[in-house]
Interface confidence: low
């Protein structure tokens, strides 16, 4: 027989010869990093037809690294489902926790022993420092010094010293996020007050009030013979300006060769029209608003035209 077969997990005991006699036996041992588990044979014999009898290295098993427990509030995931040397261990933390240490450890061979490349990481609870304080406002849980994952705080504005209230600009609720950062910037509290919107040759059909604060919404209708140039609905924005701008009511021109559409009591159907959002503040009117036949709005005797909650 010629030289005996070579294997990944076991090696020949002694030096190989150029050829072997029929009936001659060779023995193998497990390579470094592998260990023998009986009963499979680790030897072979030169057969009379000049071939080696079948043998495999299935009896030699890779050394494995020590078992790693799941970190508290996390998981240790063997990359290939095995702890054998040459493979990796991945660490993941549960939601609301973050990893301190190496995310991946390698099972390495040191001498004939398989050991991990480092110390297993730990999973620490996601914590946020207190959210920012805001001028003219406060948030809930202001006495708490440390916030946990998904803890929420809600901002509100202080009572204003003057006649006009502070309005909350932005989202009132923020959450402690998974990277220990609050979910968004804190809102601001400031006085937002828009000028009384005057539309000549037209009238308000909703949003009656003496003062117009943040998000106050006003809707207009033009008098008979006039049409609306602009949006029928305007909203008081955070800069104390109307958005879109206050519309105009323009006179319907007498018909020429082409007839314009009938625009009596018309309301713009512009696609930019904002959905009417009820004013968040502002005193209720003490006077009777003008009667409107605008479709979808009740007459005054049927109830107030808009909710100014």
């Amino acid at each position: 027989c010629e030289e005996p077969p070579t294997f990944e997990a076991m090696e020949l005991i002694g030096k190989p010869k150029p050829y072997y006699e029929i009936g001659e036996r060779v023995d193998y041992k497990c390579k470094k990093g592998y260990f023998y588990i009986p009963p499979l044979a680790t030897h072979t014999i030169c057969d009379r037809n000049h071939t080696w009898l079948p043998v495999s290295d299935d009896a030699c098993y890779r050394e494995t690294c020590p078992y790693i427990r799941d970190p508290l509030n996390g998981q240790a995931v063997p990359a290939n489902g095995t702890y054998e040397f040459g493979y990796q261990m991945h660490f993941i933390c549960n939601e609301g926790y973050y990893l301190i240490g190496e995310e991946i450890l390698y099972c390495e061979l040191k001498g004939s022993v398989a050991i991990w490349s480092g110390k297993p990481p730990i999973c620490e609870k996601v914590l946020c420092t207190p959210p920012p304080k805001i001028k003219n406002g406060k948030h809930t849980f202001s006495e708490v010094e440390v916030f946990e994952y998904l803890d929420a705080v809600t901002y509100s504005c202080d009572p204003a010293p003057g006649p006009d209230p502070f309005s909350l600009i932005g989202e009132s609720t923020i959450y402690c996020g998974d990277n220990s950062v609050w979910s968004r910037a804190a809102p601001e509290c400031k006085v937002v007050k828009c000028r009384f919107p005057v539309v000549e040759n037209g009238k308000q059909i909703s949003g009656f009030g003496k003062k117009f604060y943040y998000k106050a919404t006003v809707m207009f209708e033009c008098d008979k013979g006039f049409y609306l140039d602009g949006s029928d609905t305007i909203v008081c924005d955070s800069n104390s300006t109307w958005d879109p701008p206050v519309p105009k009511c323009l006179k319907v021109l007498p018909p020429s060769s082409t007839k314009p559409p009938a625009l009596s009591h018309s309301v713009s159907t512009s696609s930019t029209t904002k959905s009417p959002a009820s004013s968040a503040s502002g005193p209720r009117p003490t006077y009777k608003p003008p009667v409107s036949n605008y479709p979808g709005y009740p007459k005054p005797e049927e109830g107030i035209l808009d909710s100014l909650d």
Epitope: N73, N94, E95, G96, K125, E148, Y149, L150, D151, A152, L168, G170, E171, S172, T173, Y175, S183, R184, P187, K215, A277, S278, S279, A280, S307, D309
Partner: antibody, heavy 116, light 109 residues
Framework: QVQLVQSGGGVVQPGRSLRLACAAS????????MHWVRQAPGKGLEWVAV????????YYADSVKGRFTISRDNSKNTLYLQMNSLRAEDTAVYYC?????????WGRGTLVTVSS | QSVLTQPPSVSGAPGQRVTISCTGS?????????VHWYQQLPGTAPKLLIY???NRPSGVPDRFSGSKSGTSASLAITGLQAEDEADYYC?????????FGGGTKLTVL
């Protein structure tokens, strides 16, 4: 695997009591606010109650106030809903859910039928 | 009667874009509280689809998007697929109470 496992549903007569449980596996519920949400057959979702992560704050829907009690045992990683003076209109699938302003993990639900 | 109003049903053909509206008031959505969206496939528990008005949890395709303006919000689904057929619920908050819309049944034609 992170999941909420519910138990305790069944058929009960009007005026009687029932306790639902929601056990968390793969996560520690003592870090989270927990809610109960219900869904009557063929209807939409209705929020029932919430308890803060430490159990100190509880809120209830008006429809169950004074009859239902939400509680938690953080050592057992379990949320409870004690339902007393049950009415026919309490018949629903009850879900437990985790989260603060929103519910990012739900149990599979347990059916409560109130019938004589 | 739900405090948040949704259309009872919407439909669209595969590949199309559909939107579902959710209308609240100045005491919930209009007061600055976030809007969240849930998908409920037949016979299963609801699943978070959009949180904080326009954020997607991991695993939710970018075909789903949310927006909020004033007292209302909407969910848009582009490139409609057969597996999107489900009930969709919007949700928000008002003083000590979590709110849900009445739900919208999406049918993929």
């Amino acid at each position: 695997q992170v999941q909420l496992v519910q138990s305790g549903g069944g058929v009960v007569q009007p005026g009687r009591s029932l306790r639902l449980a929601c056990a968390a596996s793969g996560l520690t519920v003592n870090n989270y606010a927990m809610h109960w949400v219900r869904q009557a057959p063929g209807k939409g979702l209705e929020w029932v109650a919430v308890i803060s992560y430490d159990g100190n704050n509880k809120y209830y829907a008006d429809s169950v106030k004074g009859r239902f009690t939400i509680s938690r045992d953080n050592s057992k990683n379990t949320l409870y809903l004690q339902m007393n003076s049950l009415r026919a209109e309490d018949t629903a699938v009850y879900y437990c859910a985790k989260g603060g302003g929103y519910f990012d993990l739900w149990g599979r639900g347990t059916l409560v039928t109130v019938s004589s | 009667q739900s405090v948040l109003t949704q259309p009872p049903s919407v439909s669209g053909a595969p590949g199309q874009r559909v939107t579902i509206s959710c209308t609240g008031s100045s005491s919930n959505i209009g007061a600055g509280y976030d809007v969240h969206w849930y998908q409920q496939l037949p016979g299963t528990a609801p699943k978070l689809l959009i949180y904080g008005n326009n954020n997607r949890p991991s695993g939710v395709p970018d075909r789903f998007s949310g927006s909020k303006s004033g007292t209302s919000a909407s969910l848009a689904i582009t490139g409609l697929q057969a597996e999107d057929e489900a009930d969709y619920y919007c949700s928000s908050y008002t003083s000590g109470t979590w709110l849900f819309g009445g739900g919208t049944k999406l049918t993929v034609l």
